[in-house]
Interface confidence: low
């Protein structure tokens, strides 16, 4: 059974993940981003079901494509360096989903834009956080 300290750690990790995802979304949605139209042409796979931490496997598998798209952004916000962001997200995702069980991610038939993809995982984080608090 999860202890209160492990629940708190999970909550903090989810909050960090949420912050990073929101930051990416803010960065690419910025009206000054000249590459947004081009970025929206990239397609991302969405999870068929994402209700548990193990489903973060679906996010992990899309981190490489996400980094490639973010490399187009060239944001003026120095801390939005794609390599750093994706590395941070990857560390958090690995800790949250655990490595005890191997989970095969199931994807929905329809692909999504980067904005839809990020919003989906932001909602996922918010949903799990709400069950922990």
């Amino acid at each position: 059974a999860p202890t209160s300290s492990s629940t708190k750690k999970t909550q903090l990790q989810l909050e960090h993940l949420l912050l990073d995802l929101q930051m990416i979304l803010n960065g690419i949605n910025n009206y000054k981003n000249p590459k947004l139209t081009r970025m929206l042409t990239f397609k991302f796979y969405m999870p068929k079901k994402a209700t548990e931490l193990k489903h973060l496997q679906c996010l992990e598998e899309e981190l490489k494509p996400l980094e490639e798209v973010l490399n187009l952004a060239q944001s003026k916000n120095f801390h939005l360096r794609p390599r750093d962001l994706i590395s941070n997200i990857n560390v958090i995702v690995l800790e949250l989903k655990g490595s005890e069980t191997t989970f095969m991610c199931e994807y929905a038939d329809e692909t999504a834009t980067i904005v839809e993809f990020l919003n989906r995982w932001i909602t996922f984080c918010q949903s799990i956080i709400s069950t922990l608090t």
Partner: antibody
Framework: EVQLVQSGAEVKKPGESLKISCKGS????????IGWVRQMPGKGLEWMGI????????RYSPSFQGQVTISADKSISTAYLQWSSLKASDTAMYYC???????????WGQGTTVTVSS | EIVLTQSPGTLSLSPGERATLSCRAS???????LAWYQQKPGQAPRLLIY???SRATGIPDRFSGSGSGTDFTLTISRLEPEDFAVYYC?????????FGGGTKVEIK
């Protein structure tokens, strides 16, 4: 445990050079930015700039560009802040801090007092 | 650069009272990019709040942050003796990072 340990207090004369250090431990030093913050006597905090020790990518606040140099030696997990010619107005407490990707400073060194006086 | 103005400059309160500190930005700051720090005399600052409202690891729940756009607030619900210190807000949404001038919370 994440720790940033800074070098000791310095007393210098105007025109002299100086290099202070900040050694990181308890985390992957090459994977986080290190920021430097100045606090003049009785005053607030001023962000000077940052370095990414993994590849020495460095960014400065316009107020400090050309006034100081930030560097790092990843082999010994240490970041540096240096001056080639100190002025009396450089007298301050200097802090190094680990800067998260998002931009907040989550772990701080204990600070290094620099006094410049003739 | 974004200028942050903190008010009041000094807040004189008694232990057990509620403290409300304000931070106003010269231009809109995404709430994901505002932090609060506590600094005690002779010590380095300590991160309290990031993302405007998320408490940093190990920070007691009497500390809470709120706000969006240009107006942000740090609230300490019941002041403990160890909470008397200087508090700084910081924006990290655009370069250069900037700090507010600080609010000193002192014992009345």
């Amino acid at each position: 445990e994440v720790q940033l340990v800074q070098s000791g207090a310095e007393v210098k004369k105007p025109g002299e050079s100086l290099k202070i250090s900040c050694k990181g431990s308890g985390y992957s030093f090459t994977s986080y930015w290190i920021g430097w913050v100045r606090q003049m006597p009785g005053k607030g905090l001023e962000w000077m700039g940052i370095i990414y020790p993994g590849d020495s990518d460095t960014r400065y606040s316009p107020s400090f560009q050309g006034q100081v140099t930030i560097s790092a030696d990843k082999s010994i997990s240490t970041a540096y802040l240096q001056w080639s010619s100190l002025k009396a107005s450089d007298t301050a407490m200097y802090y190094c801090a680990r800067q998260q990707v998002a931009g907040m400073l989550d772990y701080w060194g204990q600070g290094t007092t620099v006094t410049v006086s003739s | 650069e974004i200028v942050l103005t903190q008010s009041p400059g000094t807040l004189s309160l008694s232990p057990g009272e509620r403290a409300t500190l304000s931070c106003r930005a010269s231009q809109s700051v995404s709430s994901s990019y505002l932090a609060w720090y506590q600094q005690k005399p002779g010590q380095a600052p300590r991160l309290l709040i990031y993302g405007a409202s998320s408490r940093a690891t190990g920070i007691p729940d009497r500390f809470s942050g709120s706000g969006s756009g240009t107006d942000f607030t740090l609230t300490i619900s019941r002041l403990e003796p160890e909470d008397f210190a200087v508090y700084y807000c910081q924006q990290y949404g655009s370069s250069p990072l900037t700090f507010g001038g600080g609010t000193k919370v002192e014992i009345k």
